[in-house]
């Protein structure tokens, strides 16, 4: 017997659907109507034929009451080839839902997204996460998607992007966006970061994550942030192969005084990099290749320093920095 494509947990909280059949019975997803978290994986299906069975241009207001009765707050849609027109139709209908967090992963969006009709309501998301989503429209995809969202987006995550740079002149500002995560875009690099951080489009960023993004030096990142006018409180540069030395010809970069937390763990560092901010609340240098305890003059003024998992740190070694705190837990590096 074929397993049921959708599974709802005992609390009607989480529902996961895996549609792997060539012609899936989409009505099976109806059992997810009372779930708060819904995941729908379409097994790599091309949803183009689906367009013939739905009227993507129908007025979504006719579904408003039904959609409002859905419990879903977090929706994940994955593994499909989706016509942009169908995506837009879904976003228009979901605008009447309670959906707050949307994740799109392993999708290929084909065709172009039509402009938002004057009478249409945008989707009031607080979080949008994209992983391995390709868009036929290239660099303009974010601007096209943005017009279907209300301006209150707080968290934006873009991983494994085929085009992590955006068409900045078309993108509107994200006035409420406090967290931007561009992690897992190894081809991004510092020049790509400059292109992705559209100047003055991210005025409220507090947390910026750049794990595994091909960054080379903290100074290079500093320059990209300065050029974009982005002043995060927290910056995650972990899982990049960082160079400790700065190119002597590169201009010195002044870090924003807003930055108080910097994560440089798993960065392959053999010494503390030059050009760090002068003062930090939190500095994570764990799981690097530091062969000796950093000297006070190599480090910023820092309240909470983590050095676990470095070769020099053998049990019984004195703490390397006055006022620093080491967890005592040796991480698996």
């Amino acid at each position: 017997t074929t397993p049921e494509p959708c599974e709802l947990d005992d609390e009607d909280f989480r529902c996961v659907c895996n549609f792997s059949e060539p012609q899936p019975d989409w009505s099976e997803a109806f059992q997810c109507v009372s779930a708060v978290e819904v995941e729908i994986h379409a097994g790599g299906l091309n949803l183009e034929p689906f367009l013939k069975r739905v009227d993507a241009d129908a007025d979504p207001r006719q579904y408003a009451d039904t959609v409002k009765a859905l419990r879903v707050r977090r929706l994940t849609v994955g593994a499909a080839q989706v016509p942009a027109q169908l995506l837009v139709g879904a976003l228009r209908v979901l605008a009447y839902s309670r959906l707050k967090e949307l994740t799109l992963e392993d999708l290929k969006i084909t065709g172009t997204m039509p402009p938002l009709p004057l009478e249409a309501t945008g989707l009031a998301l607080s979080s949008l996460r994209l992983r391995n989503v390709s868009w036929a429209t290239g660099r303009s995809w974010l601007a096209e998607l943005q017009q279907w969202l209300k301006p209150g987006l707080k968290v934006l995550s873009i991983a494994q992007a085929h085009s992590p740079a955006f068409s900045c002149e078309q993108v509107r500002a994200f006035p409420a966006l406090t967290s931007l995560d561009l992690s897992d875009n190894p081809g991004l690099g510092e020049r790509g970061l400059m292109a992705a951080l559209c100047p003055h489009k991210f005025p409220a960023i507090q947390n910026l994550a750049l794990r595994n993004t091909g960054m080379e030096t903290p100074t290079g990142v500093c320059a990209a942030l300065a050029a974009a006018g982005v002043q995060p409180h927290s910056l995650d540069l972990s899982h990049n192969s960082l160079r400790a030395t700065v190119n002597p010809s590169a201009p010195r970069c002044m870090w924003s005084s807003a930055l108080n937390s910097l994560n440089l763990s798993f960065a392959g560092l053999e010494q503390v990099p030059k050009g760090l901010p002068a003062k930090l609340r939190v500095l994570d240098l764990s799981c690097n290749r530091l062969n000796r305890a950093p000297q006070p003059d190599e480090l910023p003024e820092v309240d909470n320093l983590t050095l676990d998992g470095n070769p020099f740190l053998v049990p019984g070694t004195a703490l390397p920095h006055e006022g620093s705190m080491n967890s005592g837990v040796v991480p698996a590096c």
Epitope: D12, F13, V36, R74
Partner: antibody
Framework: LVKPGGSLKLSCVAS????????MSWVRQTPEKRLEWVAS???????YYPDNVKGRFTISRDNARNILYLQMSSLRSEDTAMYYC?????????WGQGTTLTVSS | QSPASLAVSLGQRATISCRAS??????????MHWYQQKAGQPPKSSIY???NLESGIPARFSGSGSRTDFTLTINPVEADDVATYFC?????????FGGGTKLGNQ
Amino acid sequence: LVKPGGSLKLSCVASGFTFSSYAMSWVRQTPEKRLEWVASISSGGTTYYPDNVKGRFTISRDNARNILYLQMSSLRSEDTAMYYCARGYYDYHYWGQGTTLTVSS
Amino acid sequence: QSPASLAVSLGQRATISCRASESVDSFGNSFMHWYQQKAGQPPKSSIYRAANLESGIPARFSGSGSRTDFTLTINPVEADDVATYFCQQSYEDPWTFGGGTKLGNQ
């Protein structure tokens, strides 16, 4: 007793059911006996908060040790209440005995 | 939630009402629940999703209603039922509770 602006972490040790399989919540009861939902966490660790505590309170869980936590910071006088941990997300099938928090200078 | 307090003779019926500002129904489920709280104790689930009796709760307790209007009925009332009863909705964020109904004996 905690001063305004202070922090506190509450713990709730669960027993008698498979802790890791259930959503858990914190609910508080004010001195006026009004009940208020404070935070919820799914079995997988997804968190939900009402706006009045979002950014100040953090719910977390340790499924290996069957412990539910509530980290509270920037405490205000209006956070004074009896805090209960409870099993469930939509509704609360089982409740702990509660712990009293007083926020006052 | 009404009334704020209620005095009922033992053996009689007690009816407590809860009205939501909008429908709390979703695809056949009504997200309204009832709790009993005795003095000095935590609340205890009595009825969940409008009409489902929590295990261990006597069949004298019943819940009814849909959309915006819900009722908790205790019939017949026994001395052990003296408590405060709260309704709670989990349809619209944030989940909210009624102000409570204090049930006493006449």
